[in-house]
């Protein structure tokens, strides 16, 4: 239904502290680098105008569109030019463009320093003081740094940081107790992240219809008890949820999954047996568990694939009849008979099948060319199989560190042109699929490995499109989503790479490594792995392991020496001199 | 939606000729391998004959081989079937289908062989 007052219909609907943070969410997303205060300031005009709108309706200017109030908010900020540079030229254009142009300026790597968390004590002081202030610094920090991160979510996991101080704040060690629950929403979060902004790029790039095809998959696998109408009615709404969360529409956004899990809740009984302990929670946790409820059983009695796909004599004329629902229903068919399999692998095997339609329906005899699909599929199968296997192996084998370095070492081979920090962050949280996934039971591997891999790569895709520098990045990129990861896995050794200068400076260091925290000791010794690599890209993997074996030691030595400063300044170049023979 | 439109069927003597004609709509035509099936009275559906979608490859039953010939015009969307030296045993219903479907949901034509 039309409303009078979209400005006053959103916010009736959401209530005044989930509009109020959704509308910070949504200026932070936009402009990424202005400060809390001055974000702040908007958004409470903004609420004080969607206030007097729900007060009358009909004054002025409350007819106006969501994108041209906020957009008029942020175009009269000012220093936008000095700030912003090009992003200013968005301010010269009318709606709808106004809106694409502040969306294509959305930077998926700010120069933003990392979000660092304050002593315990600090942070509950402040907490104490201004609840609502301190949550509200937290989604600032957050969108400003992960554009496109789903809105609603995000007051999920500030929620949920809100719950974490209050219940540690009141306890005598506050330390020990948030330190481990923050970094576990932290974990959470980042890939949260990374998993939407997959969404936002597979909707930007391949459409809504794309988009769709991934949501009948994952609601098959999860909903196997529905039937095919069911499955399309909510992949369409979860389509238009993530296509409004995607292009900055985030009160339509929230507002739309809200009623999604409305729906879901109200029809337990044709969807899935799985949902009540979801539908009893308050509003922000019941969409997220239903985001992430547990697959429902499979029917006990469905019939071979088979029968409706390969051996029916009907099927070039159902595809005739309605490609993309026949198709739809070929991908909801094996998708509930698989949950053991990735979204991905679903919709390669869905590419197939239509390419071996499109061929063999143009035949004179179709149905002793599609005869055999099944077993083509045979292939597509067992490569991913192969992956998860191999890497969970080696993951058990090494432990999370060692096994960054093996993907640390494999990825600069494929593509030493792309900068370090990038390599580095792509092989940190590629590494991470091992304590991620290869700890599952084994029917909840390959989805695990394939998805959150493929959700990585296209974050690697992002950052190399900023600034092109691999051919072989490029080709993989350029492709579909779904071929995307058995691209990058196959890319081998980058023979037309001129190997790197070795420059002493890049191995050196210096004390303050020392009281580094663990973590930025290991991006330490990652970086100089990679430039290692970059120096002699066919180093064996024995010689490499003889260098940081070496180089971890002589930290080691260091790090525990009286006079740090000369320990370094002196076996420093020894160091370098050994890697040098090392790899000679 | 998906239609096929069949036309042309008739009487005629043994040893006559007829041409059966079928107009689609609602798909991608030139996409699609087609067929035409026949029925006779009191018995079941039988292949007739098959036409790839460019027209390059031809399939015929045993029972027709060398007298009838598949054909199609793509920038028509119609396909075709020339029937020679027809026989009484050919009488039938005839129906056009997609790919190599066996069950038909157009009218048909009907051809009556016989003096």
């Known amino acids: 239904e039309a409303h009078k007052s979209e400005i006053a219909h959103r916010y009736n609907d959401l209530g005044e502290q989930h509009f109020k943070g959704l509308v910070l969410i949504a200026f932070s997303q936009y402009l990424q680098k202005c400060s809390y205060d001055e974000h702040a300031k908007l958004v409470q005009e903004v609420t004080d105008f969607a206030k007097t709108c729900v007060a009358d309706e009909s004054a002025a200017n409350c007819d106006k569109s969501l994108h041209t109030l906020f957009g008029d908010k942020l175009c009269a900020i000012p220093n936008l030019r000095e700030n912003y540079g090009e992003l200013a030229d968005c301010c010269t254009k009318q709606e709808p463009e106004r809106n694409e142009c502040f969306l294509q300026h959305k930077d998926d790597n700010p120069s933003l320093p990392p979000f660092e968390r304050p002593e315990a004590e600090a942070m509950c002081t402040s907490f104490k003081e201004n609840p609502t202030t301190f949550m509200g610094h937290y989604l600032h920090e957050v969108a400003r740094r992960h554009p496109y991160f789903y809105a609603p979510e995000l007051l999920y996991y500030a929620e949920q940081y809100n719950e974490i101080l209050t219940q540690c704040c009141a306890e005598a060690d506050k330390e020990s107790c948030l330190t481990p629950k923050l970094d576990g929403v932290k974990e959470k979060a980042l890939v949260s992240s990374v998993r939407q902004r997959m969404k936002c790029s597979s909707m930007q790039k391949f459409g809504e219809r794309a988009f769709k095809a991934w949501a009948v998959a994952r609601l098959s696998q999860t909903f196997p008890n529905a039937d095919f109408a069911e499955i399309t009615k909510l992949a369409t709404d979860l389509t238009k949820v993530n296509k409004e969360c995607c292009h900055g529409d985030l009160l339509e956004c929230a507002d739309d999954r809200a009623e999604l899990a409305k729906y879901m809740c109200e029809n337990q009984a044709t969807i899935s047996s799985k949902l009540q302990t979801c539908c009893d929670k308050p509003l922000l946790k019941k969409a997220h568990c239903l985001s992430e409820v547990e697959h429902d059983t499979m029917p006990a009695d469905l019939p071979a694939i088979a029968a409706d796909f390969v051996e029916d004599q009907e099927v070039c004329k159902n595809y005739a009849e309605a490609k993309d629902v026949f198709l739809g229903t070929f991908l909801y068919e094996y998708s509930r008979r698989h949950p053991d399999y990735s979204v991905s692998l679903l919709l390669r095997l869905a590419k197939k099948y239509e390419a071996t339609l499109e061929k063999c329906c143009a035949e004179a005899n179709p149905p002793a060319c599609y005869g055999t699909v099944l077993a083509e599929f045979q292939p597509l199968v067992e490569e991913p199989k192969n992956l998860v296997k191999t890497n969970c192996d080696l993951y058990e084998k090494l432990g999370e560190y060692g096994f960054q370095n093996a993907i640390l070492v494999r990825y600069t081979q494929k593509a030493p042109q792309v900068s370090t920090p990038t390599l580095v962050e792509a092989a940190r949280n590629l590494g991470r699929v091992g304590t991620k996934c290869c700890t599952l039971p084994e029917d909840q591997r390959l989805p695990c490995v394939e998805d959150y891999l493929s959700a990585i790569l296209n974050r690697v895709c992002l950052l190399h499109e900023k600034t092109p520098v691999s051919e072989h990045v490029t080709k993989c990129c350029s492709g579909s989503l779904v071929e995307r990861r058995p691209c990058f896995s196959a890319l081998t050794v980058d023979e037309t790479y001129v190997p790197k200068e070795f420059k002493a400076e890049t191995f050196t260091f210096h004390s303050d490594i020392c009281t580094l925290p663990e973590k930025e000791k290991q991006i330490k010794k990652q970086t100089a792995l990679a430039e290692l690599v970059k120096h002699k890209p066919k180093a064996t993997a024995e010689q490499l392991k003889t260098v940081m074996d070496d180089f971890a030691q002589f930290l080691d030595t260091c790090c525990k020496a009286a006079d740090k400063d000369t320990c370094f300044s002196t076996e420093g170049p020894n160091l370098v001199t050994r890697c040098k023979d090392a790899l000679a | 939606g998906v239609q096929l439109l069949e036309s042309g069927g008739g009487l005629v003597q043994p040893g006559g000729s007829l041409r059966l004609s079928c107009a689609a709509s609602?798909?991608?035509?030139?996409?699609?391998?087609m067929s035409w099936v026949r029925q006779a009275p009191g018995k079941g559906l039988e292949w007739v004959s098959s036409?790839?979608?460019?027209?390059?490859?031809?399939l015929y039953a045993d029972s027709v081989k060398g007298r009838f010939t598949i054909s199609r015009d793509n920038s028509k969307n119609t396909l075709y079937l020339q029937m020679n030296s027809l026989r009484p045993e050919d009488t039938a219903v005839y129906y056009c289908?997609?790919?190599?479907?066996?069950?038909?949901s157009s009218q048909g034509t009907l051809v009556t062989v016989s003096s």
């Open positions: 289908t997609i790919g190599g479907s066996l069950r038909y």
């Open positions: 609602g798909f991608t035509f030139s996409s699609f391998g």
């Open positions: 036409i790839s979608g460019t027209g390059s490859d031809t």
